[in-house]
Interface confidence: medium
C-alpha cells in the first residue's frame, strides 16, 4: 500500500479474511514467509553494514529537485562523434524496510504536524473491545536508504567478446581476434585497440569507424579461425555504467508513527488496525485523518518506507 | 604492390646495422604480419622475425634471433629490422615478406609479397 | 622448436614428367603450410598456402595436399620453366610457444 510521496509505506498484502485455508496449509505459509524474512533480514543487514562501512566518507548532500520535462526537437548531431555513445540515465532511491515486532503498529496520518502531536502525547489509551489498553507512540527509527542515478552508455565504437578459448598464448590471442575483427567479409572492420583477457576469454574490440560494432552485432557469434579449428565466439554490446549522485539518507519517519505495548492481545490483527484507525482519527484523542494502519499480533511484517 | 629492402652493406664483424622495408602500393593493416626472411649464398631461406601490422605490434622471432636482431615498424608503410654484434655467419640476402591473412579456412596463407632482398656482407 | 624437414634434397625428372616432394612437420602443423618455388637470384614465389589452395595465377599442375606431420607438393606435366628450388614453410600459433616459423631446406628440381 503506498501513501504520498514523501513518506510512503507499503505493507505486506494479506490474505483476504473471506480465504479459507486450511491449518496446516497456513502453518506451511507462514513457516514460509519467515525463513524468508530471516533470509532478507540477514541480507538487509549484510548489506546495511557493507553501505555503511563503503560509504560513510562519500556522503553528500544534494537536493534534486522534480522536474517536469517536455520532448521539444530531434537534436542533428554536428559530427559522427556524437553518435559514438547511446546513453541512457535511471533515478533509484531504495525503499527502506522496517520490521513491525509483536505488539506493536505502524500507523501513518496524512498530515504531519497530527502524526508529531499523537508523539508528543506519547501514551494512548485504546479501547479494544472490552480492554481499555494503553500504547505508547514513538517516531519510527528508520535506517539508511540510498539514491542514485544510473548512468548506461551502450558504445557504438566497441564490443564485447567471450567464450574466447585459451588456447593462445596472450599476444597471439591479441592479434588473432584483431585479425578476426578486421575482416569485411564477416561484418569487420579496422581495429583501433583489443583489450584480452585471457583469464575470463573475454575482450573488449575497439573499432575505428561507427557503424562496425553495430554490423558484427547482428549475429550473437562471430567466428574465430585458430589452427584451421572455427571457434565461435560471442559478441554482445560493449556497456559502461556509472554511478553519480550517490546519496545516503536516514531520519524519521514526519508522518508514520510507531504504536507499542499489545503484545498481550490475542485478536484478528484487521479487527485489532480498524480499533486503532477508529480511535486515531479522533481530534480529541490527538489524531486526524488516517492514512494507513498496520499491525503485527503474530510474526513480524515488514513495512517499506519510500522517501 | 610491392615491397623493397634497403641498408644492405659491408660491415666489419662486431657491428650493427638497420635494414629498412618499404611498401608500396598498400600500407600496413590487421590483415598483415611484416617479415624479415635471410638466406646465405647457396644456401637455403631463415626465417628471422614477423611483426603484426595492427595495433597491438605484437613481435615474433626466431629463437637464435632473439635479442640481437629487432623488428620495428616505423611507419604505416615501413619495417625495420636493426641487427647487433654482427658476424660472417650473418652474411646473406635479408627479403622482406608480407604475409597475408584471409581468415576464411584458418591461419597460414604464406608470403605472398616479397622484396628483391638486400645483401649484407660481415667481413673484416 | 619447429623442424621441417624436406625431402629430397634434389630430384631430376624429365619434361612433362611428374615431380613430387615431400615435406614432414615436427609436430602437427593443421595444414598451416605454404610451398614457393625460388629461381636463382629471384626472391620466392608463393605457390601453394593452406597445404592446398593454389595462390592466384599458379597454374593447376602445381598440386599441395597433406595434414597433420605429412603435406607433399606434387609438379606434374613438368616444362623447362618449373626448373628452380622448391621450400616448404609452416607457420604455427601455439599456446606456450612463440609464433614458430620454419623453412624445409628446400628441394632442388632439375628438368631434362
Known amino acids: 500500500m503506498e501513501a504520498d510521496k514523501d513518506d510512503t509505506q507499503q505493507i505486506l498484502k494479506e490474505h483476504s479474511p473471506d480465504e479459507f485455508i486450511k491449518d496446516e496449509q497456513n502453518k506451511g505459509l507462514i513457516d514460509e514467509i519467515t525463513k524468508k524474512n530471516i533470509q532478507l533480514k540477514k541480507e538487509i543487514q549484510k548489506l546495511e553494514t557493507e553501505l555503511q562501512e563503503a560509504t560513510k566518507e562519500f556522503q553528500i548532500k544534494e537536493d534534486i529537485p522534480e522536474t517536469k520535462m517536455k520532448f521539444l526537437s530531434v537534436e542533428t548531431p554536428e559530427n559522427d562523434s556524437q553518435l559514438s555513445n547511446i546513453s541512457c540515465s535511471f533515478q533509484v532511491s531504495s525503499k527502506v524496510p522496517y520490521e513491525i515486532q509483536k505488539g506493536q503498529a505502524l500507523i501513518t496520518f496524512e498530515k504531519e504536524e497530527v502524526a508529531q502531536n499523537v508523539v508528543s502525547m506519547s501514551k494512548h489509551h485504546v479501547q479494544i473491545k472490552d480492554v481499555n489498553l494503553e500504547v505508547t507512540a514513538k517516531p519510527v527509527p528508520l535506517n539508511s536508504g540510498v539514491r542514485f542515478q544510473v548512468y548506461v552508455e551502450v558504445s557504438k565504437m566497441k564490443i564485447n567478446v567471450t567464450e574466447i578459448p585459451d588456447t593462445l598464448r596472450e599476444d597471439q590471442m591479441r592479434d588473432k581476434l584483431e585479425l578476426s575483427f578486421s575482416k569485411s567479409r564477416n561484418g569487420g572492420g579496422e581495429v583501433d585497440r583489443v583489450d584480452y583477457d585471457r583469464q575470463s576469454g573475454s575482450a573488449v574490440i575497439t573499432f575505428v569507424e561507427i557503424g562496425v560494432a553495430d554490423k558484427i552485432l547482428k549475429k550473437k557469434e562471430y567466428p574465430l579461425y585458430i589452427n584451421q579449428t572455427c571457434h565461435r565466439v560471442t559478441v554482445s554490446p560493449y556497456t559502461e555504467i556509472h554511478l553519480k549522485k550517490y546519496q545516503i539518507f536516514s531520519g524519521t519517519s514526519k508522518r508514520t508513527v510507531l504504536l507499542t505495548g499489545m503484545e498481550g492481545i490475542q485478536m484478528d490483527e484487521e479487527i485489532v488496525e480498524d480499533l486503532i484507525n477508529i480511535h486515531f482519527q479522533r481530534a480529541k484523542n490527538g489524531g486526524g485523518e488516517v492514512d494507513v494502519v498496520k499491525c503485527s499480533l503474530g510474526q513480524p511484517h515488514i513495512a517499506y518506507f519510500e522517501e | 604492390q610491392s615491397l623493397e629492402e634497403s641498408g644492405g652493406d659491408l660491415v666489419k664483424p662486431g657491428a650493427s646495422l638497420t635494414l629498412t622495408c618499404t611498401a608500396s602500393?598498400?600500407?600496413?593493416?590487421?590483415?598483415?604480419?611484416m617479415c624479415w626472411v635471410r638466406q646465405a649464398p647457396g644456401k637455403g631461406l631463415e626465417w628471422i622475425a614477423c611483426?603484426?601490422?595492427?595495433?597491438?605490434?605484437?613481435t615474433y622471432y626466431a629463437s637464435w634471433a632473439k635479442g640481437r636482431f629487432t623488428i620495428s615498424k616505423t611507419s604505416s608503410t615501413t619495417v625495420t629490422l636493426q641487427m647487433t654484434s654482427l658476424t660472417a655467419a650473418d652474411t646473406a640476402t635479408y627479403f622482406c615478406a608480407r604475409e597475408y591473412s584471409y581468415d576464411d579456412y584458418g591461419d597460414f596463407w604464406g608470403f605472398n609479397l616479397w622484396g628483391p632482398g638486400t645483401l649484407v656482407t660481415v667481413s673484416s | 622448436a619447429l623442424v621441417m624437414t624436406q625431402t629430397p634434397s634434389s630430384v631430376s625428372a624429365a619434361v612433362g614428367g611428374t615431380v613430387t616432394i615431400n615435406c614432414q612437420a615436427s609436430q602437427n602443423i593443421y595444414t598451416n603450410l605454404a610451398w614457393y618455388q625460388q629461381k636463382p637470384g629471384q626472391p620466392p614465389k608463393l605457390l601453394i598456402y593452406?597445404?592446398?589452395n593454389l595462390e592466384s595465377g599458379v597454374p593447376s599442375r602445381f598440386k599441395g595436399s597433406g595434414s597433420g606431420t605429412e603435406y607433399t607438393l606434387t609438379i606434374s606435366d613438368l616444362e623447362c620453366d618449373d626448373a628452380a628450388t622448391y621450400y616448404c614453410q609452416s607457420r604455427l600459433y601455439s599456446r606456450i610457444a612463440d609464433r614458430a616459423n620454419a623453412f624445409g631446406g628446400g628441394t632442388e628440381v632439375v628438368v631434362k
Open positions: 611483426i603484426y601490422a595492427g595495433s597491438s605490434g605484437s
Open positions: 593452406g597445404a592446398s
Open positions: 602500393g598498400f600500407s600496413f593493416s590487421s590483415s598483415y604480419y
